[in-house]
């Protein structure tokens, strides 16, 4: 059953006398494996034999019989899916039909494939789109229908017979579908290359040429222009003639339409080849091209600069920056259109001419007021001199100057007093819009440039102002030179250096802070009692008495201070000891009684000792001793000792009593 | 080495009197430089100073608020000891009652610690 | 007269050193130099590490410093050990009408 054997190669193989012919091939026969193989050249069938006559290329049989002619001619297949055949080398007479006689254990096929050798290697087909245009990339591919693994060759791509140096891309194809060699080369063509020559050659594996195709570009570009000009520089004088003539060098496909532009701007009725300028002005100075069209679009000459030469025109004076800033630097332009340029300028400030300034910039380092003023100047070139313009106005701006603060009152100034001053300058660019003083405080500007300062504080010393337009200019401070009474009086320790005690040595100092004017006598005083008046106190051995709040003055021309009280301090050891008891100095045994050591002491007593009549030491540290329950044993005479930070003091002796109870005396 | 040993009931019934005793080796219950004192610790209440007693020309004694008139102390000569005497105990008595002695002049100066005590008896009150 | 103030409970890793305080009035720890401090290990009697606010008794290691500020005693003790693990009461005479001795809450220090 035929329909169970099914074929998959190319329909005819192409190659030429020598080379070679791969045949990829798959089949699938269902019925079971493939037993005999034989490959036919030109098969015809014999009805009386039921078999195939031709010539027997390549067989495989059970028992390997294998002809001579399998040597050049291969089955590279298998039993079951792959019939692939190789013949190397191939003749011209191997051309014709291929005939694959295949056999399993039940079923045989005959399967025919075309082979076409021609005797020289056949030529390559390049293959173009069907439109190519100036810079734009283009494909071109070259192809030939051969391809075989034995048999190696080579596509090279030709420009007039020139290898290409763009780099081509070679494929390769050996299956079931399609057998071939291409090469694809990517080419961005320029007008230039139109109508030239593009070939693409088969070589061998060595590079040995075996056949060709060629074709003839046909690349479309806009038209190509040459533009001539009379006078050849192009400079011409004002009334002079000018001629223009436009060429096209290349167009495809042919122009159409003619056009002259004068600086990117068409020129209305111009429309021919020639362009003829009569009596030209320094209007029609500018860049000159002509345009020509066709389909694919307009194409433009190179620009013809045209000079139409004359003498300056009335200048202009640019300055670069007005107002400017006194200790700025600020540079003058001159601006006069001339062809050519002027090479020669004349200056003027405030109409006098400016010796030694010929350049068209003129530039000032460092501005100062007298150069405020009116600039103009004059341009001058071969073909004459022109006209000074109207000319700029520079102002220089600066601060105030000379600025000076001036006092309106009497001399001397005291503490409390009223002060006007005034701000006073020479002369401001912009004008003075304010005033600033130094130091800042709550004060009064009755008008424009004055202070009022009421009240004046001791230690207003100096003060400047400032007079401001865009900058404020200080003046050098004024000493208000203010008188005051004493300032910061107090006492001071001088000796001892530590705290004070009893006996000791002690000298205390009035200090004060500033006092103006210097001289100035002092006061001491305790409780309101005068005691001295030199700057220190001194006493030769202080005692407790002379402990509390001493005070001095310190007084001038303008008044007297007072410090605050400070408080003298003696420390002393305890003294004036004495016991105290409670409920009395006579209590019945088993009650309580409380012995209290009473004291005085500066620092206070910080520990106390107790003793009895023995001289004995009781456990106790505290101010009072308390005995509950009191016994008749306690009866004695009791004395304490008093503790502090400079030293001891201990009372007399102080007796207690203690009496029987009526209890106890009735038990006796 | 001076030592405390205590001796005395650890169980008392409400409302009795609690005696507990303590006997001193290795110093004099005389001695003027020394107090000797009792204390007590319980769960509820810490440590707790009760008295002291202590001979300089007489004796002395002191008693915390918290126990006065119902607490005394008492010293026998004789035998270097001293005794805490605690009247109408309740449960709230129950603790450890330790002895200690308290060396009042370290050297020249005063001095304020309990530097030796009593091994502890644990007193419990119930009925 | 109410207790001095301790910390319930202070704890250190070995070799740290950890600070117990003990806050009381003018009239006990503030008004006088007699602060001691004792160590209580548990079903023994207490025993003195520190009197007289920073001094130590013969035998007590110097790891147990004492120190006073204004009515706050505290002690430290440096360079902790296994055996310092216990229960620490501060003791102060005290000028009140009813007692002559006053002690601290105490504070059990565990040793991590």
């Known amino acids: 059953d035929s329909s169970k054997w099914v074929f998959e190669h190319p329909e005819t193989l192409y190659a030429w006398e020598g080379a070679c012919v791969w045949i990829p091939c798959t089949y699938r026969a269902l019925d079971g494996d493939l037993e005999s193989f034989i490959l036919f050249h030109n098969p015809e069938y014999n009805k009386n034999t039921s078999k195939f006559d031709g010539t027997r290329l390549y067989e495989s049989t059970k028992d390997g019989k294998v002809p001579s002619e399998q040597k050049r001619v291969q089955f590279l297949g298998d039993k079951n899916k792959n019939c692939t055949l190789s013949i190397h080398p191939v003749h011209l007479n191997d051309s014709g039909q291929l005939g694959l006689r295949m056999e399993s254990k039940t079923e045989k096929w005959m399967e025919r494939i075309h082979l076409n050798v021609s005797e020289r290697p056949f030529p390559p087909h390049i293959q173009l789109p069907p439109e190519i245009q100036e810079s734009q990339e283009v494909t071109l591919t070259c192809l030939l229908n051969f391809s075989c693994y034995g048999y190696p060759i080579q596509l090279q791509w030709l420009l007039e017979g020139v290898p290409m140096r763009q780099a081509a891309v070679t494929s390769t194809s050996l299956t079931i579908k399609s057998v071939f060699t291409r090469s694809e080369l990517k080419f961005s063509p320029q007008w230039s290359h139109h109508g030239k020559i593009v070939t693409c050659q088969l070589q061998d594996a060595d590079g040995k040429f075996l056949s060709n195709d060629t074709v003839q570009l046909n690349v479309k570009h806009t038209p190509k222009l040459e533009i001539k000009v009379t006078p050849s520089d192009a400079i011409v004088r004002e009334g002079d003639s000018v001629t223009m003539t436009c060429e096209v060098s290349s167009s495809n496909p042919e122009y159409t339409t003619v056009s002259w532009l004068k600086d990117g701007t068409s020129l209305k009725k111009q429309n021919t080849f020639t362009l003829n300028l009569r009596e030209v002005t320094k209007d029609q100075s500018g860049k000159y091209c002509c345009q020509v069209s066709n389909d694919v679009g307009p194409g433009r000459s190179e620009e013809v600069f045209l000079q139409v030469q004359y003498a300056p025109e009335p200048s202009t004076v640019q300055i670069l920056h007005s107002p400017a800033v006194e200790g700025s630097q600020v540079e003058f332009l001159c601006m006069s259109l001339a062809n050519p340029l002027p090479t020669n300028y004349t200056w003027y400030h405030n109409g006098k001419e400016m010796q030694g300034r010929t350049e068209e910039k003129v530039h000032i380092p460092k501005i100062l007021p007298w150069h405020a003023g009116t600039y103009s100047c004059v341009a001058e070139n071969i073909l004459g001199t022109g006209q000074r313009g109207p000319g700029a106005e520079l102002d220089v701006q600066y601060p105030p100057k000379k600025v000076t603060t001036v006092i309106q009152n009497p001399m001397p100034i005291r503490e409390g007093d009223t002060v006007t001053l005034s701000c006073n300058y020479n002369s401001s660019n912009p004008s003075v819009t304010r005033y600033e003083w130094k130091p800042h405080g709550a004060w009064e500007e009755p008008s424009l440039g004055v202070l009022k300062i009421q009240n004046v504080g001791w230690d207003n010393t100096t003060i400047a102002c400032a007079a401001c337009n865009s900058w404020c200019s200080w003046a050098s401070p004024v000493a208000l030179n203010v008188q005051y009474a004493p300032r910061d009086v107090r006492v001071r320790k001088i000796k001892p250096l530590s705290e004070i005690h009893s006996g000791n040595s002690v000298s205390l100092q009035c200090d004060f802070s500033s006092s103006h004017p210097k001289e100035v006598q002092f006061f001491w005083e305790k409780n309101g009692r005068l005691l001295g008046k030199e700057s220190q106190l001194n006493f030769d051995s202080i005692s407790p008495e002379d402990a509390g709040s001493y005070s001095c003055w310190v007084n001038n021309s303008i008044g007297q201070t007072a410090s605050k009280a400070w408080t003298l301090e003696v420390l002393y050891a305890p003294r004036r000891l004495r016991v105290s008891m409670s409920p009395g100095d006579q209590v019945m045994e088993g009650k309580s009684a409380t012995l209290t050591c009473e004291s005085d002491a500066n620092p206070p007593v910080s520990h106390y000792t107790w003793f009895d009549w023995n001289n004995q030491s009781l456990p106790y540290h505290s101010q009072k001793l308390r005995l509950e329950p009191v016994k008749v044993q306690h009866s004695g005479a009791y004395w304490c000792q008093g503790t502090n930070s400079v030293g001891k003091g201990r009372s007399p002796l102080s007796t207690l009593t203690v009496y029987y109870s009526p209890e106890t005396i009735g038990r006796r | 080495e001076v030592q405390l040993q205590q001796s005395g009931p650890g169980l008392v019934k409400p409302s009795q009197t609690l005696s507990l005793t303590c006997a001193i080796s290795?110093?004099?219950?005389?001695?003027?430089?020394?107090?000797w004192n009792w204390i007590r610790q319980s769960p509820s209440r810490g440590l707790e100073w009760l008295g002291r007693?202590?001979?300089?020309?007489?004796?002395?004694?002191d008693y915390a608020s918290s126990v006065r008139g119902r607490v005394s102390i008492n010293v026998d000569t004789s035998k270097n000891q001293y005794s805490l005497q605690l009247n109408a105990v309740t449960p709230e008595d129950t603790g450890v009652y330790y002895c200690?002695?308290?060396?009042?002049?370290?050297?020249?100066?005063?001095?304020?610690?309990?530097?030796?005590w009593g091994q502890g008896t644990m007193v419990t009150v119930s009925s | 007269q109410s207790a001095l103030t301790q910390p319930a409970s202070v704890s250190g890793s070995p070799g740290q050193s950890i600070t117990i305080s003990c806050t009381g009035t003018?009239?006990?720890?503030?008004?006088?130099?007699?602060v001691s401090w004792y160590q209580q290990h548990p079903g023994k009697a207490p025993k003195l590490m520190i009197y007289?606010?920073?001094n130590r008794p013969s035998g007590v290691s110097n790891r147990f410093s004492g120190s006073k500020s204004g009515n706050t005693a505290s002690l430290t003790i440096s360079g902790l050990q296994a055996e310092d693990e216990a229960d620490y009461y501060c003791?102060?005479?005290?000028?009140?009408?009813?007692?002559?001795?006053?002690f601290g809450t105490g504070t059990k220090v565990t040793v991590l």
């Open positions: 200690a002695r308290d060396r009042l002049q370290d050297g020249n100066s005063w001095s304020d610690a309990f530097d030796v």
């Open positions: 290795g110093d004099s219950v005389l001695s003027n430089s020394d107090t």
């Open positions: 003018s009239s006990d720890v503030g008004g006088y130099n007699y």
């Open positions: 003791s102060s005479y005290t000028s009140s009408s009813t007692l002559v001795y006053v």
């Open positions: 007289d606010v920073s």
């Open positions: 007693t202590y001979h300089r020309s007489t004796w002395y004694d």
